[in-house]
């Protein structure tokens, strides 16, 4: 039996059941290479809680249709009193990239997955010449997914100081120049994901071969190599290669341009600081808000929901679009389609399509862009389910009581794009919210003490109480988690204070609440640190005392007590001095 989706065959894919701490390895054409699951396992389940492996799908017992792949096993299971066999079921939907298998749910007997992928489309319009898996799971089973960076047409320009050359890249996929009417990019050879343009000539300096790799929890690496035989004459006999390192920044920030960091004998090293390299839970929510510990921001679009059957209307030339975001109110036109975005043809209002459903919603804030995506709408002829992408812009003076209104900007291959200026898209970053204090008309701002990213370093507290042999290092950041650099590299990711000694590192508290003015000083309390026994968590208080002109002095450890559950630091710094009188 021929492989149903040949493009997906070259790789072993991963999916995760986060709730149950289970990692699945999937090979849809052959078998996964995991001894514990046996020689013919196509779907191998690794339960990290019990440290056990089970084959939940056998490559030999495969059955396939255009949109469903089932792998049975010979293992019995009990489902509602009847004797079944354990199996895995993968539902395929048309997508614009190779995509990723997503775990849906599991019963006693069946493990369900869903996969939106170009391999499942009725037409080849989204298929790449070369594409590789574009996601990884870290050791905590959190997904890092670069699929949103993949360009279906065009490329990214790499920032390089050389005025005579331009290096263009795509992510995980070759560069498609067919939509390009006539720039330098048009000359790039097919299949290249890294194209070097010198003068009027374009050279393939790398094609995707292997999928994305995780090198550290905040660093992902993608390698491109030139497949073609024959050396380029300007490469001194070496084969060209490109390495792109995607770096998750240590704080929220605007996106940056990919930068060339090294170039030698046609070996190009690129670094790209982008929040897409961070784990997906940091960037996305299935609701209409992003907030709390996980995301470092406070965004709430729920006030944009329309009630009482009304919806926003956006004019799209031939079509009208009816939108109701962040709610489950049925749009009247849309015939019980559960649509969040509904497309109605002006010349024939009986032609109605769901352009995205309200239960298929993703809110994403990454690299400074706030986007609401509705997918799973009615199918187009390619098999792709219509989807809508709403790009939000902050506008504090938006009409309609600050709500503003969505504007249709165009359609590309059954994806509908809108922009929406609204005051509800004005993102409050946690630092902005919480890194100051007021006392009547007096204002205090601790942001001068915040350490943002390497090459900056954490503050290290002075502790005179210990001998060199039992020395503990105390690393502190203000209104921000500690940077994982130097001796603090192993610190827990969300710790704002971290103790490091020969036994390892400890979270002494997270940044959860604002600084407070107390007894003439500023008090900063970090809580919810590591467990310290009796169901308690470590807590740290930092007292900041005004010392004009001094932004260099380090904090000092004053006390630690309550059986290691409480730490107190004192910090004499100009940042604790009154800033100015507030207006009004």
């Amino acid at each position: 039996q021929a492989a149903p989706f040949p493009e997906l065959c070259s790789y072993t894919w991963e999916a995760v059941d986060t709730k149950n701490n289970v990692l699945y390895k999937i090979n849809i054409c052959g078998s996964v290479d995991i001894v514990q699951c046996g020689p013919s396992s196509a779907v191998c389940m690794h339960d990290l809680k019990t440290r056990t492996y089970h084959s939940v799908g056998d490559s030999v017992l495969r059955s396939a249709t255009r949109s469903l792949l089932e792998f049975n096993t010979t293992v019995s299971c009990d489902q509602q009193g009847t004797n079944h066999r354990v199996q895995s079921s993968i539902a395929f939907l048309c997508g614009k990239t190779l995509g990723t298998p997503e775990f849906v749910t599991a019963t006693e007997c069946v493990h369900y997955f869903e996969w939106r992928t170009t391999a499942a489309c009725k037409k080849d319009i989204f298929k790449a010449n070369k594409e590789v898996p574009c996601y990884v799971f870290d050791e905590e089973l959190r997904k890092h997914d670069l699929n949103p960076l993949i360009k279906l047409s065009g490329a990214y320009l790499v920032d390089d100081s050389d005025p005579d050359t331009s290096l263009f890249i795509n992510v995980c996929r070759d560069i498609d120049t067919l939509r390009d009417p006539g720039s330098q990019l048009r000359a790039c050879p097919p299949g290249t994901a890294a194209c070097l343009v010198r003068g009027h000539q374009a050279f393939d300096v790398g094609q995707p071969r292997d999928g994305l790799k995780l090198v550290r929890k905040d660093r992902l690496v993608l390698s491109y190599v030139r497949e073609e035989a024959g050396k380029l004459d300007f490469c001194d006999g070496h084969s060209p290669a490109v390495t792109i390192t995607f770096v998750c920044p240590s704080e929220r920030r605007e996106g940056t341009i990919p930068k060339l960091t090294a170039k030698s004998n046609c070996r190009y090293e690129i670094e790209w600081i982008t929040e897409y390299a961070c784990h997906r839970d940091y960037l996305e929510s299935k609701t209409c808000s992003l907030s709390g510990e996980q995301q470092d921001v406070s965004i709430d679009l729920t006030p944009l929901a329309q009630s009482g059957g009304s919806s926003y209307i956006s004019d799209g030339k031939e079509y009208l679009f009816y939108l109701n975001v962040c709610g489950e109110t049925e749009i009247q036109f849309c015939n019980k389609k559960q649509a969040a975005v509904c497309q109605v043809k002006k010349s024939d209002t009986s032609q109605v399509k769901a352009a995205g459903r309200y239960h298929n919603q993703t809110l994403r804030y990454s690299d400074g862009d706030l986007t609401l995506i509705y997918f799973g709408g009615d199918e187009c002829s390619s098999g792709f389910q219509r989807m809508s992408v709403i790009n939000f812009e902050c506008n504090k003076t938006a009409g309609n009581d600050g709500k503003g209104t969505p504007v249709f900007t165009g359609e590309v291959d059954c994806t509908y794009f809108f922009t929406w200026d609204t005051e509800y898209a004005c993102v409050k970053e946690k630092e902005d919210l919480l890194c100051g204090a007021t006392d009547g008309k007096k204002r205090y701002d601790l942001s001068a003490l915040v350490r943002h990213a390497e090459p900056e370093q954490n503050w290290e507290a002075v502790d005179g109480s210990q001998t060199e042999t039992e020395k503990k290092h105390f690393f502190i950041n203000i209104c921000h988690r500690v940077l994982q650099e130097g001796k603090a590299r192993g610190c827990p990711e969300d710790a704002a204070v971290c103790a490091v000694d020969k036994n390892g590192s400890k979270n002494l508290g997270k940044f959860i609440s604002s600084p407070m003015k107390e007894k003439g000083n500023i008090q900063l309390s970090y809580s919810d640190g590591d467990d310290c026994g009796h169901g308690k968590k470590i807590k740290t208080n930092i007292t900041l005392v005004c010392k004009p002109g001094d932004l260099e002095s380090a904090p000092v450890l004053r006390t630690s007590g309550e059986g290691g559950c409480f730490y107190e630091f004192e910090w004499h710094t100009a940042a604790a001095c009154v800033l100015s009188k507030t207006e009004g």
Partner: nanobody, 123 residues
Framework: DVQLVESGGGLVQPGGSLRLSCAAS????????WGWFRQAPGKEREFVAA????????SYADSVKGRFTISRDNAKNTIYLQMNSLRPEDTAVYYC????????????????WGQGTLVTVSS
């Protein structure tokens, strides 16, 4: 392909303002990044300002920062360049262009061009 038509150029005194428009038609508006460039007599074409298609992120040449503002009206498929505090050295033919390359300000990465509109700053 995208067709681009610029308008709004003219003669203006130093310190004055002009607003250039660029109407786009043809292939889908929102897959492109948009730029304004200018070419003074006897000089190379130079970058003025750009706006990314997927958001309203903008970039400007140092010489126009704080004076010029690029914007777009997606509903009208139109790009604008608001030019304030104009100087004689801003005299040039201004071109609107489209590119499928992200993060670029290089004119050779822009594949679609308008025919240009002349801006003259003189007293």
């Amino acid at each position: 392909d995208v067709q681009l038509v610029e308008s709004g150029g003219g003669l203006v005194q130093p310190g004055g303002s002009l607003r250039l428009s660029c109407a786009a038609s043809g292939r889908t508006f929102n897959t492109y990044n948009w730029g304004w460039f200018r070419q003074a007599p006897g000089k190379e074409r130079e970058f003025v300002a750009a706006i990314r298609w997927s958001s309203s992120k903008t970039s400007y040449a140092d010489s126009v920062k704080g004076r010029f503002t690029i914007s777009r009206d997606n509903a009208k498929n139109t790009i604008y360049l608001q030019m304030n505090s104009l100087r004689p050295e801003d005299t040039a033919v201004y071109y609107c262009a489209a590119s499928i390359v992200d993060f670029t300000t290089n004119p050779s990465h822009f594949g679609s061009w308008g025919q240009g509109t002349l801006v003259t700053v003189s007293s």
